[in-house]
Amino acid sequence: ATKLTEEKYELKEGQTLDVKCDYTLEKFASSQKAWQIIRDGEMPKTLACTERPSKNSHPVQVGRIILEDYHDHGLLRVRMVNLQVEDSGLYQCVIYQPPKEPHMLFDRIRLVVTKGFSGTPGSNENSTQNVYKIPPTTTKALCPLYTSPRTVTQAPPKSTADVSTPDSEINLTNVTDIIRVPVFN
């Protein structure tokens, strides 16, 4: 059985989550990829996705989420900027591969965002923010909606213990309520 494991990040409000999801180059380089949140007792919800086909090194910005797919590295880079306490939750990268079910990339990210001062005295906070002043991408394609009889009806427990699952291709039903809102001028 494939284990679903979690990696935990505890960050402060205003900081940036910056993670990379590794994928098989030959199989998935141009496949559409997505960033999802899994709330307790709910289906995974798609927050942002790359274009289809996914473009190399082309940033897609959805609100405070920035996705960049690096085909030459086999990595999807996900950044969530200006984090808020409400962003706390369990996240995952998936690859869309219709008509098959989405393929989950390991590991899931347990994000904990707390209130408080995010830097140290004299820390250069502005320099981190400047990195993300990229023009937002306008793409017409929304993330696909999947329905399947093998739906996940319960989110995994909040503990960081391993959770067994029958195979690595977890079925994920995704929503399409994505609004691309530019947040940087």
């Epitope: 284990k3 505890e10 900081q15 098989t24 180059l25 086999g74 390991f106 990210i109 320099s127 990195v131």
Partner: antibody
Framework: EVQLLESGGGMVQPGGSLRLSCAVS????????MSWVRQAPGKGLEWVSE????????YYADSVKGRFTISRDNSKNTLYLQMNSLRVEDTAIYYC????????????WGQGTLVTVSS | EIVMTQSPATLSVSPGERATLSCRAS??????LAWYQQKPGQAPRLLIY???TRATGIPARFSGSGSGTEFTLTISSLQSEDFAVYYC??????????FGQGTKVEIK
């Protein structure tokens, strides 16, 4: 329990070759990037090379590029470092390290294997 | 290449006292920074990652803070087992992944 065990170190003359191995257990090896990190006697840590899990992408420090080759055999749960054209300054303890899935930080380390390059 | 600079090189502290170690990056690394502890004859051990997240099994007396270019590792009350060398490491963008030169925490 996660375990990483390096082997293959030893003494070699400048210009010579060595192949280091790192046998791992306790986690799904094929899913994670792995790195080699070295430490010269009495000195600090220096990242040497990385091989990603799913993509198989490889990266090298400038100091070893063209001389060292990282590889892995997922069926044997083993990471390798082929070191050619060795120099005196390559003398160090070589550690293999497991990386986080989501970033290149090293959450588990082997005990290291000593490579001595001397004439 | 991002250069990591740690200070001081050596820190002399009495057991029970507070220790504050600094790490500076030559350019912003967001919060993509880790701290490691290394004792003589042993491999490094991950303490903190993401600048402030404690790794599994690390005592609460270890805490990390900072963002951008300036980072701090604080040991609130030094225990005998905490005397060691501490390294910071950035994992921002792409390799090479670079370490600071280390700070040795010794008994005063």
């Amino acid at each position: 329990e996660v375990q990483l065990l390096e082997s293959g170190g030893g003494m070699v003359q400048p210009g010579g070759s060595l192949r280091l191995s790192c046998a791992v257990s306790g986690f799904t090896f094929s899913r994670y990037a792995m790195s080699w990190v070295r430490q010269a006697p009495g000195k600090g840590l220096e990242w040497v090379s990385e091989m990603r899990g799913s993509s198989g992408s490889t990266y090298y420090a400038d100091s070893v590029k063209g001389r060292f080759t990282i590889s892995r055999d997922n069926s044997k749960n083993t990471l390798y470092l082929q070191m050619n054209s060795l120099r005196v300054e390559d003398t160090a303890i070589y550690y293999c390290a497991k990386e986080f899935s989501s970033n290149s930080l090293f959450d588990y380390w082997g005990q290291g294997t000593l490579v001595t390059v001397s004439s | 290449e991002i250069v990591m600079t740690q200070s001081p090189a050596t820190l002399s502290v009495s057991p029970g006292e507070r220790a504050t170690l600094s790490c500076r990056a030559s350019q912003s690394v967001n919060v993509n920074l880790a701290w490691y502890q290394q004792k003589p004859g042993q491999a490094p051990r991950l303490l903190i990652y993401g600048a402030s997240t404690r790794a599994t099994g690390i005592p609460a007396r270890f805490s990390g803070s900072g963002s951008g270019t300036e980072f701090t590792l604080t040991i609130s009350s030094l225990q005998s087992e905490d005397f060691a060398v501490y390294y910071c490491q950035q994992f921002y963008n792409w390799p090479p992944w670079t370490f600071g030169q280390g700070t040795k925490v010794e008994i005063k």
